[in-house]
């Protein structure tokens, strides 16, 4: 499959197609024209085709201006103005506003809690497997294996802090060198970006919203992948991260600090600990090859224990094996010594749902995974609905201007760096980059924050999570202080290096362009988002892991041709868009490849076949849920059910009538289906100004 599907024989115009999927720029509807639409009315559909820049063909119905789908939507205020309200109306509006704010904070609280439980669920399902990944001896010599282990473990436990703490304890115990740990940390950085990508999937209902949300989430992924792509070979060749951090650690005489303040956990822990509590030491113990830990459950049963240190007599093969000469004796048959043992007495059980069920970890994990995803999805929908009803008119304008506007000239360039600091600060406050970026995702989706602004906020979040790790490292006990601090600093400098690579010069902000490209593809073919998630976070790492286990010869044998093909395709793509005349006629487009290799359309047909019957069934039940939801969000006329059903209805009614569809350019036709138009509410009771 060509890297830019749907190319057909179109020669993309670099200016127009650089950020589009498959060289297409779908038009975004002007939301202002939609305000008077109701459930019953359908606007006429115009299908627009973008032709290659060198083509002489024209369209019958060519619009004067092609709207950029990445432009933020205008959220029109259809409510009565504040000045036009009577006292009763103003009071009612005020309390409505307060109510919405409380609801928003409530859903936000449960959103963060569900992220925490999602992490616990992943740890229960894949934590032990994750621990076993670490006990692979090849990590030491194979940085690529270390990288994919970092990705897989972090994806499996849904927490980079868990995987990095395992790495720290392994380095402290000399089971791993700092050199071998660095690729794992890089992998953990990639793995942690899956959370907000999962959150973005929850916004799949509305195409234009999903386009922005998914691009906003994957900008994090692309930043991490690209940073690793450049910095891992540099690190392997120069060991610059190891050297710099070693110098820092050795030049300072650090005293043990205090733990990083748990600000968000203080609020969420009372709730999450009622659901489930985990003994995270088990994963670390498995990673350190502790055989006993493999049979232990991750679900914490006893929360209050009494630890008593006592000395017990143990037999030794000979007096040479004694703990100390003075504590060595014989009973006439065996040689004995005294050993300090810690005896743990269970006093009080934990107070969480699963404490008395004695279910296997996999069962508890599966239950929690399903429930947390449902709560996450529900909260996200409600947050988006509430924000959507609040952020209209003046409020939206003020917020959007505040967030997305740059400083006045000549300080405009500083805005992004301030955003990086804000992202770092916010992440430090919430103590989790996943929580921060996941909270950012719906805001990008509904159009409050642009991807260009979300990018530095995300980069800041990457920095914020490492400052937390540095503080945590400073609070480590003496023996672990050096290693944990060095690893935390490696993580910090890796992210700093990544920012220096992919942020300062606008031209180098590749992650934004790649994310927008992926956003476009995923908006048209929504299954591709799930496909991307599986490929990048599971299949590629697992394939590299498998090949690494087979030996470096196999890895090189398979890897080199694959890398060569990728480079070849990228070079060809670049030449096609920049200077096609250099290439022979046949290579000026992808038409020489079979359709399934250059377009997602055939794949879409296959996926549609599989999902079609399921979609029909799911619509019936989602319609019921949707109506209840519509009543809650104060818009009784918006019940077109979900976007998936809307598309299905459209397909059945056969409303898509193209104005002109020449066979040649059929594959870059942009239909209403790719627009994701959503009828706006016509409710007159909307209240936005507080």
């Amino acid at each position: 499959m060509a890297p830019w599907p749907e190319l057909g024989d179109a020669q993309p115009n670099p200016d127009k197609y650089l950020e589009g999927a498959a060289g297409q720029q779908p038009t975004a509807p002007d939301k202002s024209k939609e305000t008077n639409k109701t459930d019953n009315t359908e606007a006429p559909v115009t299908k627009i085709e973008l032709l290659p820049s060198y083509s002489t063909a024209t369209l019958i119905d060519e619009p004067t201006e092609v709207d950029d789908p990445w432009n933020l939507p205008t959220l029109q205020d259809s409510g009565i103005k504040w000045s036009e309200r009577d006292t009763k109306g103003k009071i009612l509006c005020f309390f409505q506003g307060i109510g919405r704010l409380i609801l928003l904070l409530g859903f936000l609280y449960f959103f963060v809690c569900s992220l925490d439980i999602l992490s616990s669920a992943f740890q229960l399902v894949g934590g032990k497997m994750a621990g076993q990944f670490f006990s692979n001896s090849s990590i030491m010599s194979n940085p690529l294996l270390g990288l994919v282990i970092g990705v897989l473990v972090t994806v499996l436990v849904q927490s980079s802090s868990t995987s990095t703490s395992i790495v720290v304890s392994m380095v402290s115990s000399s089971l791993l060198t700092v050199r071998a740990a660095i690729p794992i940390i890089m992998g953990a950085n990639i793995g942690t970006s899956i959370t907000n990508t999962i959150v973005a999937l929850m916004q799949v209902g509305d195409r234009s919203e999903f386009r922005r949300a998914f691009a906003g989430a994957t900008v994090h992924d692309f930043f991490n992948w690209l940073s690793v792509l450049v910095l891992l070979p540099v690190e392997v060749a120069t060991h610059y991260l190891e050297i710099i951090t070693q110098l820092i650690v050795e030049s300072f005489h650090f005293k043990n600090g205090e733990d990083a303040p748990d600000l968000l956990k203080v609020i969420t822990k009372p709730f999450t600990k009622l659901i489930v509590q985990l003994d995270k030491k088990v994963i670390s113990q498995i990673a350190m090859n502790d055989e006993k830990a493999k049979n232990k459950s991750l679900v914490k049963i006893w929360c209050k224990t009494f630890t008593n240190k006592t000395q017990i007599n143990v037999t030794v093969p000979s007096t040479a094996n004694c703990t100390s000469p003075s504590l060595c004796w014989t009973d006439g048959i065996q040689n004995w010594t005294m050993k300090n043992v810690t005896y743990k007495e269970n006093i009080a059980k934990c107070q969480h749902i699963f404490v008395n069920f004695h279910l296997p970890d996999l069962a508890v994990g599966t239950i929690l995974l399903i429930l947390s995803l449902l709560v996450l999805c529900g909260c996200l929908i409600m947050i988006v609905k509430i924000l959507g009803s609040v952020l209209k008119g003046q409020v939206a304008t003020v917020i959007k201007k505040t967030i997305n506007t740059d400083f006045p000239f000549p300080f405009a360039w500083l805005t992004g760096y301030l955003a990086i600091l804000v992202g770092a600060g916010m992440t430090f406050i919430v103590q989790s980059s996943s929580v921060f970026t996941s909270a950012l995702t719906p805001l990008i989706g509904i159009g409050v924050i642009t991807i260009e602004r979300a990018y530095p906020l995300t980069l800041g979040s990457n920095i914020g999570t490492t400052t937390t790790a540095i503080l945590a490292a400073l609070a480590s006990p003496g023996n672990a202080l050096r290693s944990s601090l060095q690893i935390a600093l490696c993580h910090f400098f890796f992210n700093i290096s990544g920012i220096l690579l992919w942020y300062p010069i606008p031209f180098t902000r590749l992650p934004i362009r790649m994310a927008k490209g992926l956003g476009n593809i995923s908006a048209k073919y929504r299954w591709f988002a799930v496909f991307y998630l599986i490929i990048f976070f599971f299949l590629i790492p697992l394939t590299v892991f498998g090949l690494s286990l087979a030996g470096w010869r196999v890895l090189v044998g398979v890897g080199v041709p694959v890398v060569f093909i990728i480079i070849l395709v990228l070079c060809l793509r670049l030449l096609q868009s920049r200077c096609p005349r250099v290439l022979p006629k046949k290579l000026q487009n992808w038409n020489f490849l079979p359709l399934w290799m250059r377009s997602l359309k055939p794949w879409d047909a296959v996926v549609s076949k599989f999902t079609g019957c399921f979609q029909m069934r799911c619509c019936c039940c989602c319609r019921v849920c949707c109506r209840a939801c519509c009543l809650l969000c104060d818009c009784p006329k918006c019940c077109r059910c979900s976007k998936c059903c809307e598309d299905l209805e459209e397909a059945q009614e056969g409303q898509d009538v193209p104005v002109k569809a020449p066979e040649t350019f059929d594959n870059i036709t942009i239909s209403r289906e790719a627009q994701g138009e959503v009828p706006a509410s016509d409710s007159k009771t909307e209240c936005t100004a507080l």
């Epitope: 007599n313 003075s326 504590l327 060595c328 014989t330 009973d331 006439g332 048959i333 040689n335």
Partner: antibody, heavy 119, light 107 residues
Framework: QVQLQQPGAELVKPGASVKMSCKAS????????MQWVKQTYGQGLEWIGA????????SYNQNFKVKATLTADKISSTAYMQLSSLTSEDSAVYYC????????????WGQGTLVTVSA | DIVMTQSHKFMSTSVGDRVSITCKAS??????VVWYQQKPGQFPKLLIY???TRHAGVPDRFTGSGSGTDFTLTISNVQSEDLADYFC?????????FGSGTKLEIK
């Protein structure tokens, strides 16, 4: 209470063997090690060896490795020590003593068996 | 083998006096030393183990001390019933070895 009963005396001819007994009562026989000690006027106290009645594991003083054989019968709660190829030097009082696992001291002793090797 | 040496074969004391019986090990035995008392015609009786721990029922006038190679059994306020042989024993390694004994006589 803990008791270790030993026959008072054994008279044997040189070159012969003797098997002396030590019947334990008042405790779980298999839970404690049984030690054997020789006392002569010239040599003082000498440790011969020990047996763990539960496992049958034995340990000997190299000086008595050939001379003594320690056994135990769990059913009758009796420990035995067989001395072979007796000479006049083997004439002594032989004590059995109980020691707990991981204890190298003897809190309970038998009355001792006086072995006299004489033609 | 570890040799336990009791340098005094005999020690003479009066009732009410304080007496110290010494025992020297040929190598470091830590605290793995035991003291026994054997009265004429009887079996040895445990007094002290782990160099200084008194066995149950032993009068507190009997005190053990020392570690490594030098050990002492002290009897304060000697009574006439204390007339006996006193043996030290090490249990640091196999074979267990005893001292040759010190006979306590009452003047």
């Amino acid at each position: 209470q803990v008791q270790l009963q030993q026959p008072g005396a054994e008279l044997v001819k040189p070159g012969a063997s003797v098997k002396m007994s030590c019947k334990a009562s008042g405790y779980t026989f298999t839970s404690y090690n049984m030690q054997w000690v020789k006392q002569t006027y010239g040599q003082g106290l000498e440790w011969i060896g020990a047996i763990s009645p539960g496992s049958g594991e034995t340990s000997y003083n190299q000086n008595f490795k050939v001379k003594a054989t320690l056994t135990a019968d769990k059913i009758s709660s009796t420990a035995y020590m067989q001395l072979s190829s007796l000479t006049s030097e083997d004439s002594a009082v032989y004590y059995c003593a109980r020691a707990a696992r991981a204890e190298g001291w003897f809190a309970y002793w038998g009355q001792g068996t006086l072995v006299t090797v004489s033609a | 083998d570890i040799v336990m040496t009791q340098s005094h074969k005999f020690m003479s004391t009066s009732v009410g006096d304080r007496v110290s019986i010494t025992c020297k090990a040929s190598q470091d035995v830590g605290h793995a030393v035991v003291w026994y008392q054997q009265k004429p015609g009887q079996f040895p009786k445990l007094l002290i183990y782990w160099a200084s721990t008194r066995h149950a029922g032993v009068p507190d006038r009997f005190t053990g001390s020392g570690s490594g190679t030098d050990f002492t059994l002290t009897i304060s306020n000697v009574q006439s019933e204390d007339l006996a042989d006193y043996f030290c024993q090490q249990f640091r390694s196999i074979p267990l070895t005893f001292g040759s004994g010190t006979k306590l006589e009452i003047k």
